[in-house]
Amino acid sequence: AAMGSCSKEYRMLLGQLQKQTDLMQDTSRLLDPYIRIQGLDIPKLREHCRESPGAFPSEETLRGLGRRGFLQTLNATLGCVLHRLADLEQHLPKAQDLERSGLNIEDLEKLQMARPNVLGLRNNVYCMAQLLDNSDMTEPTKAGRGTPQPPTPTPTSDVFQRKLEGCSFLRGYHRFMHSVGRIFSKWGESPNRSRR
Protein backbone atom coordinates (compact mmCIF):
# COMPACT_ATOMS: atom_id res chain seq x y z
CA ALA A 1 0.00 0.00 0.00
CA ALA A 2 1.10 3.56 -0.57
CA MET A 3 2.27 5.35 2.57
CA GLY A 4 -0.60 6.81 4.54
CA SER A 5 -3.35 4.77 2.86
CA CYS A 6 -4.65 1.40 4.02
CA SER A 7 -6.16 -1.37 1.95
CA LYS A 8 -9.37 -2.77 3.42
CA GLU A 9 -8.81 -6.07 1.62
CA TYR A 10 -7.27 -8.53 4.07
CA ARG A 11 -5.82 -10.95 1.53
CA MET A 12 -4.35 -8.19 -0.62
CA LEU A 13 -2.75 -6.58 2.42
CA LEU A 14 -1.44 -9.94 3.64
CA GLY A 15 -0.12 -10.57 0.13
CA GLN A 16 1.75 -7.26 0.23
CA LEU A 17 3.24 -8.15 3.63
CA GLN A 18 4.24 -11.57 2.31
CA LYS A 19 5.81 -10.04 -0.78
CA GLN A 20 7.68 -7.40 1.22
CA THR A 21 9.09 -9.91 3.69
CA ASP A 22 10.00 -12.25 0.82
CA LEU A 23 12.10 -9.50 -0.74
CA MET A 24 13.56 -8.25 2.55
CA GLN A 25 14.95 -11.65 3.55
CA ASP A 26 16.94 -11.72 0.29
CA THR A 27 20.58 -10.99 1.18
CA SER A 28 21.33 -9.84 -2.38
CA ARG A 29 19.24 -6.71 -1.68
CA LEU A 30 21.10 -5.49 1.41
CA LEU A 31 23.76 -7.63 3.12
CA ASP A 32 25.65 -8.63 -0.03
CA PRO A 33 25.94 -5.07 -1.41
CA TYR A 34 26.98 -3.84 2.05
CA ILE A 35 29.73 -6.46 2.23
CA ARG A 36 31.03 -5.47 -1.21
CA ILE A 37 30.89 -1.73 -0.58
CA GLN A 38 32.63 -2.02 2.77
CA GLY A 39 35.42 -4.21 1.40
CA LEU A 40 34.43 -7.21 3.51
CA ASP A 41 34.07 -9.52 0.52
CA ILE A 42 37.05 -11.66 1.52
CA PRO A 43 36.53 -15.15 3.02
CA LYS A 44 38.46 -14.40 6.22
CA LEU A 45 36.54 -11.18 6.81
CA ARG A 46 33.15 -12.70 5.96
CA GLU A 47 33.74 -15.23 8.73
CA HIS A 48 33.58 -12.40 11.26
CA CYS A 49 30.18 -11.26 9.97
CA ARG A 50 28.02 -13.31 12.32
CA GLU A 51 24.63 -12.43 13.71
CA SER A 52 24.79 -11.05 17.25
CA PRO A 53 22.59 -13.23 19.51
CA GLY A 54 19.54 -11.43 20.90
CA ALA A 55 19.69 -8.48 18.50
CA PHE A 56 16.33 -9.52 17.03
CA PRO A 57 13.43 -11.56 18.44
CA SER A 58 13.73 -15.25 17.58
CA GLU A 59 11.21 -17.07 15.41
CA GLU A 60 10.24 -19.10 18.47
CA THR A 61 9.46 -15.88 20.38
CA LEU A 62 7.46 -14.48 17.45
CA ARG A 63 5.47 -17.69 17.11
CA GLY A 64 4.52 -17.49 20.77
CA LEU A 65 2.74 -14.18 20.22
CA GLY A 66 -0.84 -13.76 19.05
CA ARG A 67 -1.42 -11.80 15.86
CA ARG A 68 -1.82 -8.61 17.84
CA GLY A 69 1.38 -9.07 19.83
CA PHE A 70 3.26 -10.19 16.74
CA LEU A 71 2.32 -7.04 14.82
CA GLN A 72 3.21 -4.83 17.78
CA THR A 73 6.60 -6.52 18.15
CA LEU A 74 7.23 -6.29 14.42
CA ASN A 75 6.27 -2.61 14.41
CA ALA A 76 8.64 -1.85 17.30
CA THR A 77 11.49 -3.87 15.79
CA LEU A 78 11.13 -2.13 12.44
CA GLY A 79 11.36 1.18 14.28
CA CYS A 80 14.74 0.07 15.64
CA VAL A 81 15.79 -1.11 12.20
CA LEU A 82 15.02 2.30 10.69
CA HIS A 83 17.28 4.03 13.24
CA ARG A 84 20.09 1.57 12.63
CA LEU A 85 19.81 1.79 8.84
CA ALA A 86 20.00 5.59 9.08
CA ASP A 87 23.20 5.21 11.10
CA LEU A 88 24.65 2.77 8.56
CA GLU A 89 23.81 5.09 5.67
CA GLN A 90 25.76 7.94 7.27
CA HIS A 91 28.94 5.87 7.12
CA LEU A 92 28.59 4.64 3.55
CA PRO A 93 31.02 5.92 0.92
CA LYS A 94 29.72 8.57 -1.48
CA ALA A 95 28.82 7.68 -5.06
CA GLN A 96 31.87 9.47 -6.53
CA ASP A 97 34.18 7.58 -4.13
CA LEU A 98 32.65 4.30 -5.22
CA GLU A 99 33.27 5.11 -8.88
CA ARG A 100 36.90 5.96 -8.15
CA SER A 101 37.28 2.64 -6.31
CA GLY A 102 35.72 0.74 -9.22
CA LEU A 103 32.82 -0.44 -7.04
CA ASN A 104 29.26 -0.87 -8.29
CA ILE A 105 26.98 2.16 -7.91
CA GLU A 106 23.99 -0.24 -8.01
CA ASP A 107 25.10 -1.63 -4.65
CA LEU A 108 24.82 1.82 -3.10
CA GLU A 109 21.38 2.29 -4.67
CA LYS A 110 20.23 -1.02 -3.16
CA LEU A 111 21.38 0.08 0.27
CA GLN A 112 19.61 3.41 -0.11
CA MET A 113 16.36 1.59 -0.93
CA ALA A 114 16.42 -0.26 2.41
CA ARG A 115 14.86 2.48 4.51
CA PRO A 116 11.98 3.27 2.10
CA ASN A 117 11.28 -0.47 1.91
CA VAL A 118 11.15 -0.80 5.69
CA LEU A 119 8.85 2.24 5.88
CA GLY A 120 6.55 0.61 3.33
CA LEU A 121 6.48 -2.62 5.31
CA ARG A 122 5.85 -0.75 8.55
CA ASN A 123 2.95 1.10 6.96
CA ASN A 124 1.39 -2.21 5.91
CA VAL A 125 1.97 -3.67 9.40
CA TYR A 126 0.06 -0.69 10.80
CA CYS A 127 -2.69 -1.19 8.21
CA MET A 128 -2.99 -4.88 9.08
CA ALA A 129 -3.22 -4.02 12.78
CA GLN A 130 -6.03 -1.58 11.96
CA LEU A 131 -7.77 -4.23 9.88
CA LEU A 132 -7.59 -6.66 12.80
CA ASP A 133 -9.04 -3.89 14.97
CA ASN A 134 -5.90 -3.24 16.98
CA SER A 135 -6.78 0.30 17.89
CA ASP A 136 -3.90 0.90 20.28
CA MET A 137 -1.07 0.36 17.85
CA THR A 138 1.06 3.43 17.34
CA GLU A 139 1.06 5.00 13.90
CA PRO A 140 4.19 4.04 11.96
CA THR A 141 5.48 7.60 11.70
CA LYS A 142 5.36 8.24 15.46
CA ALA A 143 7.54 6.88 18.24
CA GLY A 144 5.75 4.06 20.02
CA ARG A 145 5.10 3.80 23.73
CA GLY A 146 7.50 1.20 25.03
CA THR A 147 9.25 0.94 21.69
CA PRO A 148 12.71 -0.50 22.40
CA GLN A 149 15.65 1.70 21.58
CA PRO A 150 17.65 0.73 18.51
CA PRO A 151 20.60 -1.53 19.31
CA THR A 152 23.49 0.84 19.94
CA PRO A 153 26.74 -0.03 18.20
CA THR A 154 29.69 -0.43 20.59
CA PRO A 155 31.34 2.98 20.95
CA THR A 156 34.52 2.67 18.95
CA SER A 157 36.76 4.70 16.73
CA ASP A 158 37.64 1.53 14.86
CA VAL A 159 36.13 1.91 11.37
CA PHE A 160 36.68 -1.77 10.65
CA GLN A 161 34.83 -2.78 13.82
CA ARG A 162 31.88 -0.56 12.83
CA LYS A 163 31.76 -2.25 9.41
CA LEU A 164 31.63 -5.67 11.07
CA GLU A 165 28.88 -4.54 13.44
CA GLY A 166 26.88 -3.27 10.48
CA CYS A 167 27.41 -6.59 8.75
CA SER A 168 26.24 -8.55 11.83
CA PHE A 169 23.18 -6.34 12.17
CA LEU A 170 22.19 -6.87 8.52
CA ARG A 171 22.68 -10.62 8.80
CA GLY A 172 20.35 -10.61 11.82
CA TYR A 173 17.88 -8.40 9.97
CA HIS A 174 17.65 -10.82 7.03
CA ARG A 175 17.20 -13.77 9.39
CA PHE A 176 14.49 -11.87 11.28
CA MET A 177 12.66 -11.04 8.04
CA HIS A 178 12.87 -14.72 7.07
CA SER A 179 11.16 -15.61 10.36
CA VAL A 180 8.53 -12.90 9.85
CA GLY A 181 7.88 -14.18 6.33
CA ARG A 182 7.39 -17.73 7.59
CA ILE A 183 4.85 -16.51 10.12
CA PHE A 184 2.92 -14.43 7.59
CA SER A 185 2.85 -17.41 5.21
CA LYS A 186 0.97 -19.36 7.87
CA TRP A 187 -1.72 -16.71 8.36
CA GLY A 188 -5.07 -17.93 7.12
CA GLU A 189 -7.35 -16.68 4.42
CA SER A 190 -9.64 -14.82 6.81
CA PRO A 191 -8.73 -12.05 9.25
CA ASN A 192 -10.25 -14.05 12.12
CA ARG A 193 -7.84 -13.36 14.97
CA SER A 194 -8.32 -16.75 16.60
CA ARG A 195 -6.65 -18.53 13.66
CA ARG A 196 -2.87 -18.53 13.91
Epitope: A1, A2, Q16, Q18, K19, Q20, F184, G188, E189
Partner: antibody
Protein backbone atom coordinates in the same frame (compact mmCIF):
# COMPACT_ATOMS: atom_id res chain seq x y z
CA UNK B 1 5.22 -29.28 -16.56
CA UNK B 2 2.82 -26.68 -15.18
CA UNK B 3 -0.08 -26.14 -17.58
CA UNK B 4 -3.53 -24.56 -17.67
CA UNK B 5 -6.08 -25.39 -20.36
CA UNK B 6 -9.35 -23.47 -20.64
CA UNK B 7 -12.53 -24.74 -22.28
CA UNK B 8 -16.24 -24.01 -22.42
CA UNK B 9 -16.21 -20.84 -24.52
CA UNK B 10 -18.49 -20.27 -27.47
CA UNK B 11 -21.34 -18.15 -28.77
CA UNK B 12 -24.11 -17.41 -26.29
CA UNK B 13 -27.14 -15.13 -26.36
CA UNK B 14 -27.42 -12.09 -24.06
CA UNK B 15 -29.01 -12.95 -20.70
CA UNK B 16 -27.93 -16.59 -20.89
CA UNK B 17 -25.33 -18.42 -18.78
CA UNK B 18 -22.06 -20.19 -19.52
CA UNK B 19 -19.58 -22.16 -17.44
CA UNK B 20 -15.88 -22.05 -18.28
CA UNK B 21 -13.43 -24.71 -17.13
CA UNK B 22 -9.69 -24.59 -16.57
CA UNK B 23 -7.88 -27.91 -16.19
CA UNK B 24 -4.62 -27.63 -14.25
CA UNK B 25 -1.75 -30.06 -14.56
CA UNK B 26 1.75 -30.15 -13.03
CA UNK B 27 0.54 -28.57 -9.78
CA UNK B 28 -2.35 -28.77 -7.34
CA UNK B 29 -5.01 -26.06 -7.18
CA UNK B 30 -4.97 -26.48 -3.38
CA UNK B 31 -1.40 -25.09 -3.28
CA UNK B 32 -1.82 -21.88 -5.30
CA UNK B 33 -4.16 -19.03 -6.00
CA UNK B 34 -5.66 -19.34 -9.50
CA UNK B 35 -7.30 -16.39 -11.26
CA UNK B 36 -9.53 -15.60 -14.20
CA UNK B 37 -8.41 -12.66 -16.35
CA UNK B 38 -10.28 -11.54 -19.45
CA UNK B 39 -9.43 -9.59 -22.58
CA UNK B 40 -12.04 -8.03 -24.85
CA UNK B 41 -11.18 -8.10 -28.58
CA UNK B 42 -8.43 -5.57 -29.32
CA UNK B 43 -8.48 -4.37 -25.70
CA UNK B 44 -6.40 -4.68 -22.55
CA UNK B 45 -6.45 -7.17 -19.69
CA UNK B 46 -8.98 -7.14 -16.86
CA UNK B 47 -8.75 -9.19 -13.65
CA UNK B 48 -11.99 -11.02 -12.88
CA UNK B 49 -11.65 -13.26 -9.82
CA UNK B 50 -9.39 -15.59 -7.84
CA UNK B 51 -9.79 -18.69 -5.70
CA UNK B 52 -7.02 -19.12 -3.14
CA UNK B 53 -5.42 -22.36 -2.03
CA UNK B 54 -7.70 -22.64 1.01
CA UNK B 55 -10.81 -22.08 -1.11
CA UNK B 56 -11.63 -18.46 -0.27
CA UNK B 57 -12.49 -16.20 -3.19
CA UNK B 58 -12.06 -12.58 -4.27
CA UNK B 59 -13.83 -10.81 -7.13
CA UNK B 60 -13.54 -7.67 -9.16
CA UNK B 61 -16.57 -5.70 -7.94
CA UNK B 62 -17.65 -5.25 -11.57
CA UNK B 63 -18.39 -9.00 -11.84
CA UNK B 64 -19.25 -10.03 -8.31
CA UNK B 65 -23.02 -10.24 -8.77
CA UNK B 66 -22.97 -12.25 -12.01
CA UNK B 67 -19.81 -14.40 -11.94
CA UNK B 68 -18.87 -17.21 -9.55
CA UNK B 69 -15.43 -18.81 -9.30
CA UNK B 70 -15.16 -22.36 -7.95
CA UNK B 71 -13.04 -25.48 -8.25
CA UNK B 72 -13.21 -29.24 -8.07
CA UNK B 73 -10.16 -30.45 -6.15
CA UNK B 74 -10.61 -34.07 -7.23
CA UNK B 75 -10.45 -33.03 -10.90
CA UNK B 76 -7.88 -30.27 -10.28
CA UNK B 77 -10.16 -28.02 -12.32
CA UNK B 78 -11.16 -24.37 -11.92
CA UNK B 79 -14.53 -22.99 -13.06
CA UNK B 80 -16.10 -19.64 -13.84
CA UNK B 81 -19.89 -19.60 -13.84
CA UNK B 82 -21.10 -16.56 -15.80
CA UNK B 83 -24.76 -15.55 -15.56
CA UNK B 84 -26.84 -12.81 -17.21
CA UNK B 85 -24.26 -12.39 -19.94
CA UNK B 86 -24.02 -9.11 -21.85
CA UNK B 87 -22.47 -8.14 -25.16
CA UNK B 88 -19.65 -6.40 -23.25
CA UNK B 89 -18.66 -9.74 -21.69
CA UNK B 90 -17.38 -10.83 -25.10
CA UNK B 91 -13.71 -11.59 -24.51
CA UNK B 92 -11.01 -14.20 -24.32
CA UNK B 93 -11.04 -15.62 -20.78
CA UNK B 94 -7.70 -16.78 -19.40
CA UNK B 95 -6.97 -18.69 -16.23
CA UNK B 96 -3.64 -17.85 -14.64
CA UNK B 97 -1.84 -18.97 -11.48
CA UNK B 98 -0.10 -17.04 -8.74
CA UNK B 99 3.63 -17.75 -8.48
CA UNK B 100 3.57 -19.33 -5.01
CA UNK B 101 1.34 -20.26 -2.11
CA UNK B 102 1.23 -16.71 -0.72
CA UNK B 103 -1.50 -14.20 -1.59
CA UNK B 104 0.24 -12.90 -4.71
CA UNK B 105 -2.03 -11.14 -7.18
CA UNK B 106 0.13 -11.54 -10.27
CA UNK B 107 0.50 -14.37 -12.73
CA UNK B 108 3.44 -16.55 -13.76
CA UNK B 109 1.60 -19.20 -15.80
CA UNK B 110 -1.31 -18.55 -18.15
CA UNK B 111 -3.59 -20.77 -20.18
CA UNK B 112 -4.17 -20.11 -23.88
CA UNK B 113 -7.63 -18.73 -23.22
CA UNK B 114 -11.14 -19.53 -24.39
CA UNK B 115 -13.24 -17.10 -26.44
CA UNK B 116 -16.71 -16.17 -25.23
CA UNK B 117 -18.93 -14.30 -27.70
CA UNK B 118 -22.18 -12.85 -26.43
CA UNK B 119 -24.42 -12.08 -29.37
CA UNK B 120 -28.03 -12.43 -30.43
CA UNK C 1 -9.09 1.61 -8.22
CA UNK C 2 -5.62 2.53 -9.46
CA UNK C 3 -5.53 3.47 -13.14
CA UNK C 4 -2.28 2.63 -14.93
CA UNK C 5 -1.49 4.74 -18.00
CA UNK C 6 1.10 3.39 -20.42
CA UNK C 7 3.04 5.53 -22.86
CA UNK C 8 3.53 5.68 -25.70
CA UNK C 9 0.53 3.79 -27.02
CA UNK C 10 2.67 2.65 -29.98
CA UNK C 11 6.45 2.62 -30.25
CA UNK C 12 8.11 2.10 -33.65
CA UNK C 13 11.73 0.96 -33.49
CA UNK C 14 14.21 -1.19 -35.39
CA UNK C 15 15.96 -4.34 -34.19
CA UNK C 16 19.09 -3.48 -32.23
CA UNK C 17 17.60 -0.26 -30.83
CA UNK C 18 16.69 0.41 -27.21
CA UNK C 19 13.02 0.54 -26.16
CA UNK C 20 11.77 2.48 -23.15
CA UNK C 21 8.16 1.88 -22.11
CA UNK C 22 6.53 3.87 -19.32
CA UNK C 23 3.72 3.10 -16.89
CA UNK C 24 2.25 5.77 -14.63
CA UNK C 25 -0.16 5.11 -11.77
CA UNK C 26 -2.98 7.33 -10.58
CA UNK C 27 -1.69 6.56 -7.06
CA UNK C 28 1.58 5.27 -5.67
CA UNK C 29 2.18 1.51 -5.89
CA UNK C 30 4.70 -0.71 -4.13
CA UNK C 31 5.76 -2.89 -7.05
CA UNK C 32 5.11 -3.13 -10.76
CA UNK C 33 4.79 -6.22 -12.98
CA UNK C 34 5.27 -6.39 -16.74
CA UNK C 35 3.88 -8.84 -19.31
CA UNK C 36 4.52 -9.42 -23.00
CA UNK C 37 1.73 -10.55 -25.31
CA UNK C 38 2.06 -11.62 -28.92
CA UNK C 39 -0.93 -11.88 -31.30
CA UNK C 40 -3.06 -14.93 -30.59
CA UNK C 41 -1.06 -15.83 -27.49
CA UNK C 42 -1.50 -15.53 -23.74
CA UNK C 43 0.49 -12.90 -21.84
CA UNK C 44 3.88 -13.91 -20.46
CA UNK C 45 5.36 -12.58 -17.20
CA UNK C 46 8.56 -10.62 -17.88
CA UNK C 47 9.33 -8.59 -14.76
CA UNK C 48 8.18 -9.12 -11.19
CA UNK C 49 8.60 -6.86 -8.15
CA UNK C 50 9.53 -3.87 -10.37
CA UNK C 51 12.99 -5.06 -11.36
CA UNK C 52 13.33 -8.85 -11.06
CA UNK C 53 13.46 -10.87 -14.26
CA UNK C 54 10.92 -13.68 -14.36
CA UNK C 55 12.18 -17.20 -15.03
CA UNK C 56 13.61 -17.70 -18.53
CA UNK C 57 13.45 -14.01 -19.53
CA UNK C 58 16.59 -12.69 -21.30
CA UNK C 59 18.77 -10.10 -19.57
CA UNK C 60 18.09 -7.45 -22.23
CA UNK C 61 14.80 -6.82 -20.39
CA UNK C 62 14.97 -4.67 -17.27
CA UNK C 63 12.52 -2.84 -15.04
CA UNK C 64 12.85 0.14 -12.75
CA UNK C 65 10.82 2.81 -10.98
CA UNK C 66 9.03 3.63 -7.76
CA UNK C 67 5.98 5.49 -6.51
CA UNK C 68 3.79 6.31 -9.49
CA UNK C 69 6.34 6.02 -12.33
CA UNK C 70 7.76 2.77 -13.68
CA UNK C 71 9.78 1.83 -16.76
CA UNK C 72 10.40 -1.29 -18.79
CA UNK C 73 13.58 -1.15 -20.88
CA UNK C 74 14.60 -3.53 -23.66
CA UNK C 75 18.25 -2.78 -24.32
CA UNK C 76 18.91 -4.40 -27.70
CA UNK C 77 15.72 -5.22 -29.56
CA UNK C 78 15.44 -8.66 -31.13
CA UNK C 79 12.84 -9.44 -33.82
CA UNK C 80 10.87 -11.57 -31.33
CA UNK C 81 10.47 -8.63 -28.93
CA UNK C 82 7.91 -6.86 -31.10
CA UNK C 83 4.65 -7.36 -29.23
CA UNK C 84 2.26 -5.62 -26.83
CA UNK C 85 3.50 -4.93 -23.29
CA UNK C 86 1.28 -4.50 -20.23
CA UNK C 87 2.11 -3.23 -16.75
CA UNK C 88 0.16 -4.46 -13.73
CA UNK C 89 -0.16 -3.48 -10.06
CA UNK C 90 -1.66 -5.18 -7.03
CA UNK C 91 -0.85 -2.67 -4.30
CA UNK C 92 -4.47 -1.60 -4.28
CA UNK C 93 -7.69 -3.50 -4.87
CA UNK C 94 -8.54 -4.64 -7.46
CA UNK C 95 -5.40 -5.60 -9.42
CA UNK C 96 -5.29 -3.51 -12.57
CA UNK C 97 -3.41 -3.47 -15.87
CA UNK C 98 -2.29 -0.65 -18.11
CA UNK C 99 -3.92 -0.35 -21.53
CA UNK C 100 -0.75 -1.65 -23.22
CA UNK C 101 2.08 -0.35 -25.39
CA UNK C 102 2.43 -1.83 -28.84
CA UNK C 103 6.07 -2.20 -29.87
CA UNK C 104 6.22 -2.45 -33.64
CA UNK C 105 8.96 -2.76 -36.24
CA UNK C 106 9.84 0.52 -37.92
Amino acid sequence: QVQLVESGGGVVQPGRSLRLSCAASGFSLTNYGVHWVRQAPGKGLEWVAVIWRGGSTDYNAAFMSRFTISRDNSKNTLYLQMNSLRAEDTAVYYCAKSPNSNFYWYFDVWGRGTLVTVSS
Amino acid sequence: EIVLTQSPATLSLSPGERATLSCSGSSSVSYMYWYQQKPGQAPRLLIEDTSNLASGIPARFSGSGSGTDYTLTISNLEPEDFAVYYCQQWSSYPPTFGQGTKLEIK
